[in-house]
């Protein structure tokens, strides 16, 4: 069929998602080409029952969510709107510090170990978490 | 079982084109992502392109982007792979090559086909 | 572009002998790492993935290990059909990168 009516294997759903959790850690970049691979997007954020869930999967580690201010303005990678959409910043963030000497400012949002937000390095190795919708993707395959 | 059967190979002269397709079966296609590997006449392996199982999402070397183009038919279980502009550096056995997932073994090339032979030169 | 690295380039070894071949990544890959076998004329065949994971139908005297930017792939008691060319490919990052090979012949 051309919907699926079920989360792939190792995936999580929840509210008509389906979310995956990675155990290591990559570039805000790297992480995204790995869930477009999957036909999926880094998670998006809109609402506080969703962020309550992802931080209850994460735990407390930097991991990587799908919202960047890399051409200027925050945008989150499925177009959804930044301006009128659910934040959770960290007090005085994002504040796309400079002086971590790696050159650059922070472009890249990720949970913190308290699940607030954080703009930092898009180059740092957090880890990261993948979503896609369930009426989106073709149906899953059983294991091969 | 699965298998993996590329065509469309040959001789071409510089700055032609050609496109092979590879012909899947034994596996749900649509569910995975898919990919193009080259292996130059007695040289190693080097990855050409990716795209994801629905085909909305493509991934290509440095070498070949601009150049070449990787699509697919999910209705007819194809994988394709345009080369344009082709050069003689291009010369190479073209493997079709399905990924593994993700979230179960990590996105390795875990199914090859047999390779066809494109020949660049005048 | 991460490079792979691998040595070395080739090895003459009898049928019996333990055989191990290393592979490095210009850059930590965590265990983003796969291990291919190819033969002459044919396909490559996925033997490790993730540094150390087993491809279904895999003979158990292959075994990989490593983790950041160093890696192995060890043959325990090569076998006449293990005479092949040995790569390692990184998974971490797009573009994926292959090792330049290991030619294991017979001595």
């Known amino acids: 069929g051309s919907e699926r009516t079920c989360c792939p294997v190792n995936w999580v759903e929840h509210e008509r998602s389906c979310y995956w959790f990675s155990r290591s850690g990559k570039a805000w970049a790297d992480a995204d080409n790995y869930c477009r691979l999957e036909d999926a997007h880094l998670v998006v954020v809109t609402s506080w029952e969703e962020q309550k869930f992802v931080q209850h999967h994460i735990g407390p580690v930097n991991t990587w969510m799908g919202l960047h201010d890399q051409n200027g303005p925050w945008k989150w990678v499925d177009g959804t709107d930044y301006e009128t959409g659910f934040k959770n910043w960290r007090p005085e963030q994002p504040d796309d510090w400079y002086g971590h000497g790696l050159g650059g400012g922070e472009d890249c949002a990720h949970f913190t170990d308290d699940g607030r937000w954080n703009d930092d390095v898009c180059q740092r190795p957090y880890r990261w978490v993948c979503e896609t919708e369930l009426d989106k993707a073709s149906q899953e395959p059983p294991l091969l | 079982e699965v298998q993996l059967l590329e065509s469309g190979g040959g001789l071409v002269q510089p700055g032609g084109s050609l496109r092979l397709s590879c012909a899947a079966s034994?596996?749900?296609?649509?569910?995975?992502?898919m990919s193009w590997v080259r292996q130059a006449p007695g040289k190693g392996l080097e990855w050409v392109s990716a795209?994801?199982?629905?085909?909305?999402?493509?991934f290509y070397a440095d070498s070949v982007k601009g150049r070449f183009t990787i699509s697919r038919d999910n209705s007819k279980n194809t994988l394709y792979l345009q080369m344009n502009s082709l050069r003689a550096e291009d010369t190479a056995v073209y493997y079709c090559?399905?990924?593994?997932?993700?979230?179960?073994?990590?996105?390795?090339?875990?199914?090859w086909g047999q390779g066809t032979l494109v020949t660049v030169s005048s | 572009d991460i490079q792979m690295t691998q040595s070395p380039s080739s090895v003459s070894a009898s049928v019996g002998d333990r055989v191990t071949i290393t592979c490095r990544a210009s850059?930590?890959?965590?265990?983003?790492l796969a291990w291919y076998q190819q033969k002459p004329g044919k396909a490559p065949k996925l033997l490790i993935y993730?540094?150390?994971s087993f491809q279904s139908g895999v003979p158990s005297r292959f075994s990989g290990s490593g983790s950041g930017t160093d890696f192995t792939l060890t043959i325990t008691s090569l076998q006449p059909e293990d005479f092949a060319t040995y790569y390692c490919?990184?998974?971490?990052?797009?573009?994926?990168?292959f090792g330049p090979g290991t030619k294991v012949d017979i001595k």
């Open positions: 090559a399905k990924l593994g997932r993700i979230a179960v073994t990590g996105p390795y090339f875990d199914y």
């Open positions: 034994g596996f749900t296609f649509s569910s995975y992502a």
């Open positions: 795209i994801s199982g629905s085909g909305g999402n493509t």
């Open positions: 850059q930590a890959i965590n265990d983003w």
């Open positions: 993730a540094a150390s």
């Open positions: 490919q990184q998974a971490s990052s797009f573009p994926f990168t």
